[in-house]
């Protein structure tokens, strides 16, 4: 019979013969022959192959380097790579998450609009009129000024974006 020029899905052409690819999680040991099937071997510990393949070596799992602030989010298998994420209080510097940086804090006068996650930094916003923040924080929102009226007090010192109002007693009219 004529040697094939193309093979079926998940096969490859070698020496005028269609051989089966190795399934994910296995590497190629030897090509098929007229008499034998493709020989594949499972990847070793800490190795993987995530496609149908004819690779003779498996890939090493990604190392989540703690010195770069990384930790394992999902342990790799023979068919998948390890997924890294950042330690608590840190976030990835890129989408590929190859290293981490400390979450940004919002300065006094600014509050947290969105708390940081493992993949995104803190988003800060200026405290609007009627609100303040007197701390540098990665968690604190702007707080509303104290309402002196509800405490039967009067404003003695106006609030700013960094300080609360100061309330004091109302002046009593003497007879």
């Amino acid at each position: 019979p004529e040697p094939p020029t193309a093979c079926r899905e998940k096969q490859y052409l070698i020496n005028s013969q269609c051989c089966s690819l190795c399934q994910p999680g296995q590497k190629l040991v030897s090509d098929c022959t007229e008499f034998t099937e493709t020989e594949c071997l499972p990847c070793g510990e800490s190795e993987f192959l995530d496609t149908w393949n004819r690779e003779t070596h498996c890939h090493q799992h990604k190392y989540c380097d703690p010195n770069l602030g990384l930790r394992v989010q999902q342990k790799g298998t023979s068919e998948t790579d390890t997924i890294c994420t950042c330690e608590e209080g840190w976030h990835c510097t890129s989408e590929a998450c190859e290293s981490c940086v400390l979450h940004r804090s919002c300065s006094p006068g600014f509050g947290v609009k969105q708390i940081a996650t493992g993949v995104s930094d803190t988003i800060c916003e200026p405290c609007p009129v009627g609100f303040f923040s007197n701390v540098s924080s990665a968690f604190e929102k702007c707080h509303p000024w104290t309402s002196c009226e509800t405490k039967d007090l009067v404003v003695q010192q106006a609030g700013t974006n960094k300080t609360d109002v100061v309330c004091g007693p109302q002046d009593r009219l003497r007879a």
Epitope: L49, D50, W52, T80, E95
Partner: nanobody, 126 residues
């Protein structure tokens, strides 16, 4: 949940060029491979090109090798397919696909992809 939105398709003369884009949202981009597939009327969906995240390794179908180029821009969460020297037989609906996290290698089979876009029509007139 992952959303993929293709754009850049259209009608072009044979020998012309188009650049397809696929914007990904709702996922952490840059940790898994992406690919392009196409389906012509009355034909099976076929692999076109793929790009992995380990060193940006690429794979191409023999029919497009040397004419098409796949690339990614992690900053804008987009994968591109630059198509040059287009032929009438390139006419098809082009769909982008993404593998799940932990699958960094460029893959050529449909069942190795986890998320799919709706597709964009490319028509090449002779």
């Amino acid at each position: 949940q992952v959303q993929l939105q293709e754009s850049g398709g259209g009608l072009v003369q044979a020998g012309g060029s188009l650049r397809l884009s696929c914007a990904a949202s709702g996922r952490t981009f840059g940790r898994s491979a992406m690919g392009w597939f196409r389906q012509a009327p009355g034909k099976e969906r076929e692999f076109v090109a793929a790009i992995g995240t380990r060193g940006g390794s690429t794979k191409y179908a023999d029919s497009v090798k040397g004419r098409f180029t796949i690339s990614t821009d992690n900053a804008s969460n987009t994968v591109y397919l630059q198509m040059d020297s287009l032929k009438p037989e390139d006419t098809a609906v082009y769909r982008c696909a993404v593998r799940g996290p932990g699958y960094p290698s460029a893959a050529i089979f449909q069942d190795e992809y986890h998320y799919w876009g709706q597709g964009t029509q490319v028509t090449v007139s002779s």
